[in-house]
């Protein structure tokens, strides 16, 4: 069965850091562009960023609100995607989903909740 | 799975005569949403890849001579070559692309009598 499972969410103070993981199974992970998408409570979806495949240079791209604070990486040998979140702000509070594909996100995880609060 | 059955397996036709090849699908390939039959015909000559002749049962592909025509609907289809030319010697395949797994017929070998 194809699935993505996120972990690492939790409660953190403003200015703090958190590292999210997304473990993939049932798909050829190294062939997928991997994305992070977030959804603040009661709000819509916001693309956070992505990492391309090794064959596409493993380049990363980020949305403006997180650029410079968030970093996406991947470990193809472990079929795992990471999101390192630094200098967290209260407005980063959201459910964070990993989503895999080239362009359209045909595979999603169930999400992990990140709460930034003092 | 949809099974495609062609007949005859082979046929020999004189130059200038009509060649008729039949294809039956085990279930309908007519899509009610747009009234189109998802059936194609291909020609394959030795040492070459197949070449699309007909799509949607009766639409000739670009550059295909008008002596080739396709007809039929639902489960029964026909490819007609109205006036056989020497260069038409080949194997002809029907194919359904209505639903995976996409399936080809077994092929019909056309020779000159």
């Amino acid at each position: 069965e194809v699935q993505l499972v996120e972990s690492g969410g939790g409660l953190v103070k403003p200015g703090g850091s958190l590292r999210l993981s997304c473990a993939a199974s049932g798909l050829t992970f190294e062939r997928a562009w991997m994305n992070w998408v977030r959804q603040a409570p009661g709000k819509g979806l916001e693309w956070v960023g992505r990492i391309k495949r090794k064959t596409d240079g493993e380049t990363t791209d980020y949305a403006a609100p997180v650029k410079g604070r968030f970093s996406i990486s991947r470990d193809d040998s472990k079929n795992t995607l990471y999101l390192q979140m630094n200098s967290l702000k209260t407005e980063d509070t959201a459910v964070y989903y990993c989503a895999g594909s080239n362009r359209a996100f045909d595979i999603w995880g169930q999400g992990t909740m990140v709460t930034v609060s003092s | 799975d949809i099974v495609m059955t062609q007949s005859p397996d082979s046929l020999a036709v004189s130059l200038g005569e009509r060649a008729t090849i039949n294809c039956k699908s085990s279930q309908s390939v007519l899509y009610a949403g747009n009234n189109r039959n998802y059936l194609a015909w291909y020609q394959q000559k030795p040492g070459q890849p197949p070449k699309l002749l007909i799509n949607q049962a009766s639409t000739r592909a670009s550059g295909v001579p008008d002596r080739f025509s396709g007809s039929g609907s639902g489960t029964e289809f026909t490819l007609i070559i109205s006036s056989l030319q020497a260069e038409d010697v080949a194997i002809y395949y029907c194919q359904q692309y209505y639903t995976p797994p996409l399936a080809f017929g077994g092929g019909t070998k056309l020779e000159i009598k």
Partner: antibody, heavy 121, light 111 residues
């Protein structure tokens, strides 16, 4: 010019792996599905499956699950077929063919010239 | 950034009727003949689910009552006939230009 250019013939031993490439030119690669078709010597055509070039999602026919992998190098407009644990019965010509990606999969209007794979000890 | 504006923000449709959701992009999301616009369905407590990719292509396993159309800057998702389980929030999403962006969502309720 619209074309699919396949890699050259391969001679392999049983148990080995082969990877065939199919490079597209003359059209938007991500607009079309890439299908793979096998033709054993003197036999008919058999659809192996296809890969959605937009999402990267592969679909395999039942007879081609397990040892057969479809992949993409989107930036190079290239599709790949990889066959693992080769068997003598994998000896065939393998064609890539351009198809569709919608609710209906579309006919194959552009074909590669084929790649002959011979498996022999 | 490409801004995607969905309308209406919410709509209520009777069972068996047609639901139409619009998505307008602030600039074209077409590239080389393709429209890089996708549609997702999200139900409460669940991740989004891909319905339509490249403007009009139905994702595998999605019922044919869902259809997408449009190009350039104007796109539409149609659901016909609407069924009970279609109650959800629908999002359009463009991947033509970074940053990839989503529409604000349209909440579909069944009358």
């Amino acid at each position: 010019q619209i074309q699919l250019v396949q890699s050259g013939p391969e001679l392999k031993k049983p148990g080995e792996t082969v990877k065939i490439s199919c490079k597209a030119s003359g059209f938007t690669f991500t607009n079309y599905g890439m299908n793979w078709v096998r033709q054993a010597p003197g036999k008919g055509l058999k659809w192996m499956g296809w890969i959605n070039t937009y999402t990267g999602q592969p679909t395999h026919a039942d007879d081609f699950k397990g040892r057969f992998a479809f992949s993409l190098e989107t930036s190079a407009r290239t599709a790949f077929l990889e066959i693992n644990s080769l068997q003598n019965e994998d000896t065939a010509t393998y064609f890539c063919a351009r198809g569709g990606m919608g609710v209906r999969l579309r006919y194959f209007d552009v074909w590669g010239a084929g790649t002959t794979v011979t498996v022999s000890s | 950034d490409i801004v995607l504006t969905q309308s209406p923000a919410s709509l209520a449709v009777s069972l068996g009727q047609r639901a139409t959701i619009s998505c307008k992009a602030s600039q074209s999301v077409d590239y080389d003949g393709d429209s890089y616009m996708d549609w997702y369905q999200q139900k409460p407590g669940q991740p989004p689910k891909l319905l339509i990719y490249a403007a009009s292509n139905l994702e595998s396993g999605i019922p044919a009552r869902f259809s997408g159309s449009g190009s350039g800057t104007d796109f539409t998702l149609n659901i016909h006939p609407v069924e009970e389980e279609d109650a959800a929030t629908y999002y359009c999403h463009q991947t033509n230009e970074d940053p990839w962006t989503f529409g604000g969502g349209t909440k579909l309720e069944i009358k």
